[in-house]
């Protein structure tokens, strides 16, 4: 950023006759840091917050208003005043955010679309840090709203403040939101998707629980692969390794359905490359794709369930029948 | 594509007054300001005025005020100036121009409309 | 009113030269300041802002500098499409100003 002198080393200079301000208008784009400083009173400017984000001032004219601000309020602003501070939040440093105490999603909206298009900067982490604790949990309209300002959002959250988001916030997510997420947190958060979105008929229910699938356990994607789902190989890709290994030949042929010729190409890849190396050479030889796999006819199987599922029983109870 | 298109050239005799489009199209016209700029044959470039599309406030150049009017109908993305009381040395290209509405780092005129020129002459 | 002047005037200069156009302002400006290039007939067109960065589709042989009251614009190579007129233009604070332009003209 540009070195400036700080809004403190403004000099107190008193106000010229005829330019106190009586309100915050337009005419004071054309004040002098000092006229500003000298001529707006930090009270009026608080309860007229609203209408600084609708006049151009300068980088350096706010500067001084936050200045302002900072004198009234050294404990943090209110509230009623961070909801109207427009561009001006964007002057505010984690340390300044750290004081407030933001209740209302409204105002957190208000905060996020001044730095819409940019990357989440240490500011906006910070505010939405403390509206989060402040809430006590990810709530569905939170996440709904972080989300859509920042896709990236539940994926830089801990597993530890992952399971914090309740199931029913879990409608929110869209599928580019998990892009960047790793398996750990994919873990926390596929059993909450799977209980969200339990009562939904069987082709829906994949499409929405298709990319939390990194979290599935094997049995999961057994119970999957009854029902011609036809998982794409960038979902595949993206599955575990240790859920993936225990899957038979038929199984991963029934799960990927026409996408299984794609196995070929990601022969070098986990965890595809793994998976090949646990069957036997007769069964791979049935898919027909040239598979070089152990030439052993033993098949290991090492089962890990970390989840106990109840897919088998959501698609029975329901009678799905399934459209490719 | 980001467009700034104007209102054809005028002609007016001392004393009348002059108003001149600018319609937006291809960005979020409440998410800018509108600047009017004018320039006279074979001088430099004079700042006039600024509009906010969003709430319709302005500001005008000092040498201006009592004479220029910026008005702004969003239902068509649509600004207007207008001066009034014009002299022989009001002649002169006029163009609207755009910022960003921002923290205050971003006050360079980034999409300019073609000009409109505006004569005057008894 | 902050006052911009610019130098030279007028600039001769031939294809493949480089070419440097200065801007003074009358009081620091940080670096609040755009450039522009105007050919007859045309509106201005943003070339650099924030003293030094290239606005987009702008070539890379343009290129800003400067902070306070002092600011340069340089052509690294002239090639036939930049001779036009250049302008600076401070936006620290209002009203805004520009310099009174710089013709770059061929030698």
């Known amino acids: 950023d540009a070195a400036q002198p700080a809004a403190s080393e403004v000099e107190k200079t008193a106000c010229p006759s005829g330019k106190k301000a009586r309100e915050i208008d337009e005419s004071l784009i054309f004040y002098k840091k000092w006229e500003l400083e000298a001529c707006v009173d930090a009270a009026l400017l608080a309860t007229q917050m609203d209408r600084v984000n609708a006049i151009p001032f300068t980088y350096e004219q706010l500067d001084v208003l936050k200045h302002k601000l900072d004198e009234l309020y050294p404990q943090g602003y209110p509230e009623s005043v961070i909801q109207h501070l427009g561009y001006l939040f964007l002057k505010m440093s984690p340390e300044d955010i750290r004081k407030w105490n933001v209740t209302s999603l409204e105002t957190l909206k208000a905060l996020l679309e001044v730095n819409k298009g940019h990357e989440m900067s240490p500011q906006v982490a910070t505010l939405i840090d403390r509206f989060v604790k402040g809430r006590g949990q990810l709530d569905k309209d939170t996440l709904d709203t972080l989300t859509a300002f920042y896709p990236g959002y539940l994926c830089s959250l801990s597993p530890e403040e992952l399971s914090s988001v309740p199931p029913s916030s879990i409608w929110a997510v869209r599928p580019q939101d998990l892009d960047t997420c790793d398996p750990r947190q994919l873990d926390v958060l596929y059993p909450k998707a799977r209980l969200a979105f339990q009562n939904m008929n069987g082709s829906e229910y994949f499409v929405k629980i298709q990319s939390f699938l990194g979290g599935a356990p094997t049995e999961d994607l057994k119970a999957l692969s009854q029902q011609n789902v036809s998982m794409d190989l960038a979902t595949f890709m993206k599955l575990r390794t240790d859920a993936v290994l225990p899957l038979t030949v038929a199984e991963v042929q029934k799960l990927l359905g026409p996408h299984v010729e794609g196995l070929k190409a990601e022969e070098r890849h986990r965890p595809v490359r793994d998976w090949i190396l646990r069957q036997r050479q007769d069964d791979l030889d049935t898919l027909g794709l040239g598979l070089q796999g152990t030439r052993g006819s033993h098949h290991h199987h090492h089962h890990e369930f970390r989840h106990d599922s109840g897919l088998n029983d959501i698609f029975e109870a329901q009678k799905i029948e399934w459209h490719e | 594509q980001v467009q700034l298109v104007q209102s054809g050239a005028e002609v007016r005799a001392p004393g009348a007054s002059v108003k001149i489009s600018c319609k937006a199209s291809g960005f979020t016209f409440r998410g800018y300001y509108i600047h009017w700029v004018r320039q006279a044959p074979g001088q430099g470039l004079e700042w006039m005025g600024i509009?906010?599309?969003?709430?319709?406030?302005?500001a005008y150049a000092q040498k201006f005020q009592g004479r220029v009017t910026m008005t702004r109908d969003t239902s068509t993305s649509t600004v207007y100036m207008e001066l009034s009381s014009l002299r022989s040395d009001d002649t002169a290209m006029y163009y609207c121009?755009?910022?960003?509405?921002?923290?205050?780092?971003?006050?360079?005129?980034?999409?300019w409309g073609q000009g409109t020129l505006v004569t005057v002459s008894s | 009113d902050i006052q911009m002047t610019q130098s030279p005037p007028t600039l001769s200069a031939s294809v493949g030269d480089r070419v440097t156009i200065t801007c003074r302002a009358s009081?620091?400006?940080?670096?609040?300041l755009a450039w522009y290039q105007q050919k007859p007939g045309k509106a201005p067109k943003l070339l650099i802002y924030k003293s030094s960065s290239l606005a987009s589709g702008v070539p890379s042989r343009f290129s800003g500098s400067g902070s306070g009251a002092e600011f340069t614009l340089t052509i690294s190579s002239l090639q036939p499409d930049d001779f036009a007129t250049y302008y600076c233009?401070?936006?620290?604070?209002?009203?805004?100003?520009f310099g009174g332009g710089t013709k770059v003209d061929i030698k």
């Open positions: 009081e620091n400006v940080n670096i609040w």
């Open positions: 121009a755009r910022t960003a509405s921002c923290g205050g780092d971003c006050y360079y005129l980034d999409y």
């Open positions: 509009i906010n599309p969003s709430g319709g406030s302005r």
């Open positions: 233009q401070q936006y620290q604070s209002y009203p805004l100003t």
